[in-house]
Interface confidence: medium
């Protein structure tokens, strides 16, 4: 299906707004720090070609490929080389090397201040006085700091934000309505974001038949009345969506979402009765519904899966036939079976079956070699039930804060030269696992335990990629994507690691500390773990503990004093001897 | 435009076997999802047993299972379906039906079939 212009067909698909709306995300995504002005002039030149290319599509330029005008673009802006240095050098390239260039050159963690909320009226007067700005500014803001993000959800984050503007800026008690809301979609948006740079590197670091192994396994779990033939079209279908948003092919990645979504709402009878209600909303609504859709009840009279995977006399030869295909079936009919199963559980056992063929298959008699295969899968199920349980049971003692506090001594321990921001940043999230999913039914917990622990754990990845210090992590990030999480969770303390030497300046904190948020002071007091464990990484549960309730006490007294730096200056250095003692 | 004709259908007794053949013409059948469906008075058309295309995976119905045999002669562009242990509620019209655009994976819904044959009657009885 082919067009004379790209650029055009992709305008009149997409409509002004969103075209504009993925034009400036593209953007903000590749280059980070450009000024929002700088970004908005080249969104409107974009525009105006697309335009004159609607009107005419034989007219100059208008033949040429989206990467090739959008390219071309980016390499128009002065400062490049200043603000870049060498990503300027991708402008002297070809496509399609020049936009592979732009996308390594995407930093997942780029040097930009955190944002800051200004004061409710602030916000409403800005939506008020020029609402297309406002919005456009969330966008920029969000896709910059979040290059992988995706791009048609991000619009409908905007939707939602705007929503919520246009909703609590009318409202009696503005802060009221309003804070909850942006709370929510930030919390949301910083998951989506995460969820989304996972599918990212598998599709990057693994290839398309990781991504579409992993599309089988939870769009069977989602849809287990529809048939393989329906599941197989749907996950063709998403792959290249996905490849298309994190290739940085963003208004082909909106209009192949929406042709998926459009499929789906026409296909419903046979994929699934869940549905309906998402295809009653507008589009950007809809496409998201039906990605977070619930798992649709299992067929009641589905039949053992040992007759046709072990039992039967074929089992070699259709494996023989077409792996991929066959793999895919078994992959298929496990995971509808097993909802309570985590996608990234449901892989190692399409993995640890696929092996079991290749061995067997080549066997003097195949089927007594293979006759026990499901036997072996009782140990991979087994070690992450067993993890979730431990790790709630731990969660529900200590409640999340001291729930992330032990973890952040755990992958201290294990991976010591990671440094202090990332291992406070990731133990965090890591830590949110309780609150997020301890509180489920049993035959929900794995699921979301393990594969939310997956998303965290690449952000782990990602961040260690770009600046590579562990070849624990290393290792554990690149051998297995599926097994990227026993990986972590097998390593022990790493004896190798030669202490950090203590230096008083990581201890000394002073009166600022008392004006801080809830959730700064813990990750002030939980940066000063990580140090403690990076000096003494032998050191004892108890002795820990201990040195974080006297600072605890010794912050909370400095902030009731009147003079909090003068008691800051003169309980600091005392705080940090008794530490010292303590550790000894 | 594709066209199938089934045939070997018959009377047979309770444990006997027929072979029945279905030759397309129109297109290539080892390019095609193919899969044979049967349909008993008053009754909806039910999958038997499918061939992927381009690939032999197959697939049965569960009532099946280890008494028929689905295979393909690429070279004579024809589908057929070995049953043996014939049993009485195998009584039915027998229909081949093709399904061009997904190679690979054949499907147990009838309506997903775009071409089929007329069908062959196949009679278990004492």
């Known amino acids: 299906d082919t067009h004379k212009s790209e650029v055009a067909h992709r305008f009149k698909d997409l409509g002004e707004e969103h075209f504009k709306g993925l034009v400036l995300v593209a953007f903000s995504q590749y280059l980070q720090q450009c000024p929002f002005e700088e970004h908005v002039k080249l969104v409107n030149e974009v525009t105006e070609f697309a335009k004159t290319c609607v009107a005419d599509e034989s007219a100059e330029n208008c033949d040429k490929s989206l990467h090739t005008l959008f390219g071309d673009k980016l390499c128009t802006v002065a400062t490049l080389r200043e603000t870049y240095g060498e990503m300027a050098d991708c402008c002297a390239k070809q496509e399609p090397e020049r936009n592979e260039c732009f996308l390594q050159h995407k930093d997942d963690n780029p040097n930009l201040p955190p944002l800051v909320r200004p004061e409710v009226d602030v916000m409403c007067t800005a939506f008020h006085d020029n609402e297309a700005t406002f919005l456009k500014k969330y966008l920029y803001e969000v896709a910059r700091r979040h290059p992988y993000f995706y791009a048609p959800e991000l619009l409908f984050f905007a939707a939602r934000y705007k929503a919520a503007f246009a909703e609590c800026c009318q409202a009696a008690d503005k802060a009221a309505c309003l804070l909850p809301k942006l709370d929510e979609l930030r919390d949301e948006g910083k998951a989506s974001s995460a969820k989304q740079r996972l599918k990212c590197a598998s599709l990057q670091k693994f290839g398309d038949r990781a991504f579409k192994a992993w599309a089988v396994a939870r769009l069977s779990q989602k849809f287990p009345k529809a048939e393989f033939a329906e599941v197989s079209k749907l996950v063709t279908d998403l792959t290249k969506v996905h490849t298309e948003c994190c290739h940085g092919d963003l208004l082909e990645c909106a209009d192949d979402r929406a042709d998926l979504a459009k499929y789906m709402c026409e296909n419903q009878d046979s994929i699934s009765s869940k549905l309906k209600e998402c295809c009653d909303k507008p589009l950007l609504e809809k496409s998201h519904c039906l990605a977070e859709v619930e798992n649709d009840e299992m067929p009641a009279d589905l039949p053992s899966l040992a007759a046709d995977y072990v039992e039967s006399k074929d089992v070699c030869k259709n494996y023989a036939e077409a792996k991929d295909v066959f793999l895919g079936m078994f992959l298929y009919e496990y995971a509808r079976r097993h909802p309570d199963y985590s996608v990234m559980l449901l892989l190692r056992l399409a993995k640890a079956y696929e092996a079991t063929l290749e061995k067997c298959c080549a066997a003097a008699d195949p089927h007594e070699c293979y006759a026990k295969v499901f036997d072996e899968f009782q140990p991979l199920v087994e070690e992450p039930q067993n993890l979730v349980k431990q790790n709630c049971e731990l969660f529900e003692q200590l409640g999340e804060y001291k729930f992330q506090n032990a973890l952040l001594v755990r992958y201290t321990k294990k991976v010591p030269q990671v440094s202090t921001p990332t291992l406070v940043e990731v133990s965090r999230n890591l830590g949110k696992v309780g609150a997020k999913c301890c509180k489920l039914p049993e035959a929900k917990r794995m699921p979301c335990a393990e594969d939310y622990l997956s998303v965290v754990l690449n952000r782990l990845c990602v961040l260690h990629e770009k600046t590579p210090v562990s070849e624990k992590v290393t290792k554990c990030c690149t051998e297995s994507l599926v097994n990227r999480r026993p990986c972590f969770s097998a390593l022990e303390l790493d004896e190798a690691y030669v202490p950090k030497a203590f230096n008083a300046e990581t201890f000394t904190f002073h009166a600022d500390m008392c004006t801080l948020s809830e959730k700064e002071k813990q990750v002030k007091k939980q940066t000063a773990l990580v140090e403690l464990v990076k000096h003494k990484p032998k050191a004892t549960k108890e002795q820990l503990k201990g040195v974080m309730d006297n600072f605890a006490a010794f912050v909370e007294k400095c902030c009731k004093a009147d003079d909090k730096e003068a008691c800051f200056a003169e309980e600091g250095p005392k705080f940090v001897a008794a530490s010292q003692a303590a550790l000894a | 435009e594709v066209q199938l004709l089934e045939s070997g259908g018959g009377l047979v007794q309770p444990g006997g076997s027929l072979r029945l053949s279905c030759a397309a013409s129109?297109?290539?059948?080892?390019?095609?999802?193919v899969a044979w469906f049967r349909q008993a008075p008053g009754k909806g058309r039910e999958f038997v047993a499918g061939?992927?295309?381009?690939?032999?995976?197959?697939y049965y119905a569960d009532s099946v299972k280890g008494r028929f045999t689905i295979s393909r002669d690429n070279s004579k562009n024809t589908l057929y379906l070995q049953m043996n242990s014939l049993r009485p509620e195998d009584t039915a019209v027998y229909y081949c039906?093709?399904?061009?655009?997904?190679?690979?994976?054949?499907?147990?819904?009838?309506?997903?079939?775009?071409?089929w044959g007329q069908g062959t009657l196949v009679t278990v009885s004492s």
């Open positions: 039906g093709t399904r061009p655009g997904r190679p690979l994976i054949t499907s147990k819904v009838a309506d997903l079939y775009p071409y």
């Open positions: 129109g297109r290539y059948i080892d390019e095609t999802a």
């Open positions: 061939i992927g295309g381009g690939v032999d995976i197959t």
